[in-house]
């Protein structure tokens, strides 16, 4: 009761490899690393087949496919392009993943090269499985601006210059505050901006003084103050977050998180301002913006902005010591001796941010949060020292630089 | 830039119609999509509203369920159902000037509009 | 719904007069609301938006003003290439609802 000679498979194996076969030997048939035995439509690592007692075998032999890895996952602001020809997904395929340059980043350079494993899975050197990620660049503007003039007295932006700047408006449209985007779903701004004006005889934050989340709107991507355009991106919100620290008599901690109902399309009008990677120095030169009033109390047409030093600590507490106002910590002060320059209403939660020259980044130094009148003399700006409340900001966001 | 209605036809009552919006020059999931349509020698009615990227969709209390907006990669398609003559008219599809969800900026962008006939 | 209320249904005005279209809305949009020009056989073309923003290319002798439930078209200087049926519009967007109605319209007549 001899059984027919056998033929392995293309591209697999027979075990035993033997001369002859009778009644009752059993084969195992296998496949070689990247394929996998195919039979009745059925993909399988082995198969096994006897000699019957009439001398046939109990199944015909299986054949041996090359592993599919299938299409790879999509890439959250990536793309991906196949090495191999004719766009193969097989065993020993590439591709490679990279994001969508300049506005995002992948995350520890990875090479973002994966092959398509004998498992049938693509697979990274260091990822193994998992996708790369895509991070939005910070802080480089495509837009550089052209001078610096040496809000209040200042100058008219150029567009696309201050590309992390949102404007909260109402949903009926009207601008009540600004903040700076942070990473792909973040707004910063001042917590004042956020809560109604407290009872003075009863200065107690409730919850229900504080903005719901569908009371207003994020606008990104805008240079008119009114005027709209089609390089605005206006966005709801999903929840905000005070500091817990804030106190709203005092100013103290006067910064706020906003979370959006989904992710900005990143462009040259859009995108995120760099945390500051340490303190700021006093003397050095910021750049303040925002919507708010000018000269003569009038709300400008289009993005203003004022280039002013960072003001030492001391000389700022002095000079708000004859209104009893006290400037802590966590607040950093800006502007000219002389006055002239400065934020005003309407600017609040806005960013201030200076240039890392060697790297030529643009990192968040503060946020407008208040002040004696505008642009007064002795009189400087006082805003929310961002870098005192990193650590806080990060933990909520979960944003690297 | 521009939109571009399409799919406009001589129906009779009750057959179903679809038509399409399709963008040139933008991304259409960047933006809110709204249809308007206006029947011979009427005004402008307002039929309802997607913003593509999320696809949330928005309907004039009159649509009743017998319209649907809906999204492709590339195109926002108006679904109708139960046509009747009352349904006559040109069919525009507007973008709004800003983008984003919550953009109540105006609509800049239309379609020269089509024309969909209901008669028996 | 919102509900909008243009007055007048039409309107005839002389070259360099003025006219002033007006629309009610049902309930409080704030500024969210827009005005269009339409002439025969075109489509529809912004005119304001936000109550009182004038869309890019429009003539100065355009403009709008009002808030809440009352909104103002209006045309100073009018010229004949003025003549068109001109609509107002709720933009109205909250977290939970779009709104986007339009008034009957107002054809303005050039004498």
């Known amino acids: 009761n001899e059984c027919p000679e056998l033929q392995p498979p293309v591209h697999g194996k027979i075990e035993p490899s033997q001369a002859k076969y009778f009644f009752k030997d059993q084969v195992l048939v296998s496949c070689d690393t990247g394929y996998k035995v195919l039979k009745d439509n059925v993909e399988m690592d082995t198969f096994q087949i006897e000699c019957l007692k009439d001398g046939t075998w109990s199944n015909k032999i299986p054949t041996c496919k090359i592993v599919d890895c299938r299409a790879p996952g999509e890439l959250e602001h990536g793309l991906i392009t196949f090495s191999t020809r004719n766009n193969l997904t097989t065993y020993k395929s590439e591709i490679k993943y990279s994001c969508q340059e300049p506005y995002y980043k992948m995350l520890n350079n990875n090479t973002g090269i994966y092959t398509c494993s004998a498992q049938g899975v693509w697979m990274n050197k260091v990822l193994g499985r998992s996708l790369p990620t895509c991070l939005p660049v910070c802080g480089l503007p495509k837009f550089s601006r052209k001078l610096m003039a040496r809000i209040f007295n200042g100058r008219p932006a150029q567009k696309g210059t201050t590309p992390w700047i949102a404007m909260l408006s109402h949903l009926n449209g009207q601008p009540f505050c600004g903040g700076s985007l942070l990473g792909s779903s973040w707004i910063v701004t001042a917590a004042h901006c956020l809560h109604q004006s407290l009872d003075p005889e009863d200065p107690t934050l409730r919850d229900s003084d504080l903005l719901s989340p569908s009371d207003f709107k994020i606008i990104l991507g805008k240079h008119w103050r009114l005027r709209s355009d089609e390089n605005e991106q206006h966005l709801g919100v999903k929840h905000t977050t005070l500091h817990p620290q804030y106190d709203p008599n005092t100013f103290e901690n006067d910064v706020a998180l906003v979370e959006l109902l989904e992710s900005p399309v990143l462009n040259a009008f859009v995108m995120p301002i760099c945390l500051p990677e340490g303190p700021q120095q006093e003397g050095a030169m910021v750049i303040v913006s925002g919507w708010g009033k000018q000269f003569l109390q009038r709300f400008p047409e289009t993005l203003m902005e004022i280039e002013i030093p960072i003001v030492d600590h001391s000389t700022c507490q002095k000079a708000y010591a004859p209104l009893k106002k006290k400037v802590t910590r966590d607040m950093i002060c800006a502007g000219e001796k002389e006055g002239g320059k400065d934020a005003c209403a309407g600017d609040a939660g806005g960013p201030m941010v200076t240039l890392n020259r060697e790297r030529g980044q643009w990192y968040l130094v503060g946020t407008v949060s208040w002040g004696d009148d505008c642009g007064k003399k002795d009189r400087y700006g006082v805003y929310s020292y961002i870098h005192h409340n990193k650590d806080w900001i990060q933990r909520v966001t979960g944003v690297r630089n | 830039q521009s939109v571009e209605e399409s799919g406009g036809r001589l129906v009779t009552p009750g057959t179903p119609l679809t038509l399409t919006c399709t963008a040139s020059?933008?991304?259409?999931?960047?933006?809110?999509i709204h249809w308007v349509r206006q029947a011979p020698g009427e005004g402008l009615e307002w039929i309802g509203y997607?913003?593509?990227?999320?696809?949330v969709t928005w309907y004039a209390s009159w649509v009743k369920g017998r319209f649907t907006i809906s999204k492709t990669s590339t195109t926002v398609d108006l679904k109708m159902t139960s046509l009747t003559t009352e349904d006559t008219a040109t069919y525009f599809c507007?973008?709004?000037?800003?983008?984003?969800?919550?953009?109540?900026?105006?609509?800049?962008?239309w379609g020269p509009g089509t024309l969909v006939t209901v008669s028996s | 719904d919102i509900v909008m209320t243009q007055t007048p249904s039409s309107v005839s005005a002389a070259v360099g007069g003025t006219v002033t279209i007006k629309c009610q809305a049902s309930q409080n949009i704030g500024y969210s609301s827009a005005w269009y020009q339409q002439k025969p056989g075109q489509r529809p073309k912004l005119m304001i938006y936000?109550?009182?923003t004038l869309a890019s290319g429009v003539p100065s002798r355009f403009s709008g003003s009002g808030s809440g439930t009352e909104y103002t078209l209006t045309i100073s200087g009018v010229q004949c290439d003025d003549a068109a049926t001109y609509y107002c519009?709720?933009?109205?967007?909250?977290?939970?609802?779009?709104?986007?109605?339009f008034g009957g319209g107002t054809k303005v007549e050039i004498k």
């Open positions: 519009q709720s933009n109205y967007i909250s977290s939970g609802s779009v709104d986007g109605t």
């Open positions: 507007a973008r709004v000037l800003a983008g984003g969800g919550y953009a109540n900026t105006g609509l800049s962008l």
């Open positions: 997607i913003y593509a990227r999320s696809g």
């Open positions: 936000g109550a009182s």
């Open positions: 020059g933008f991304d259409i999931n960047n933006y809110a």
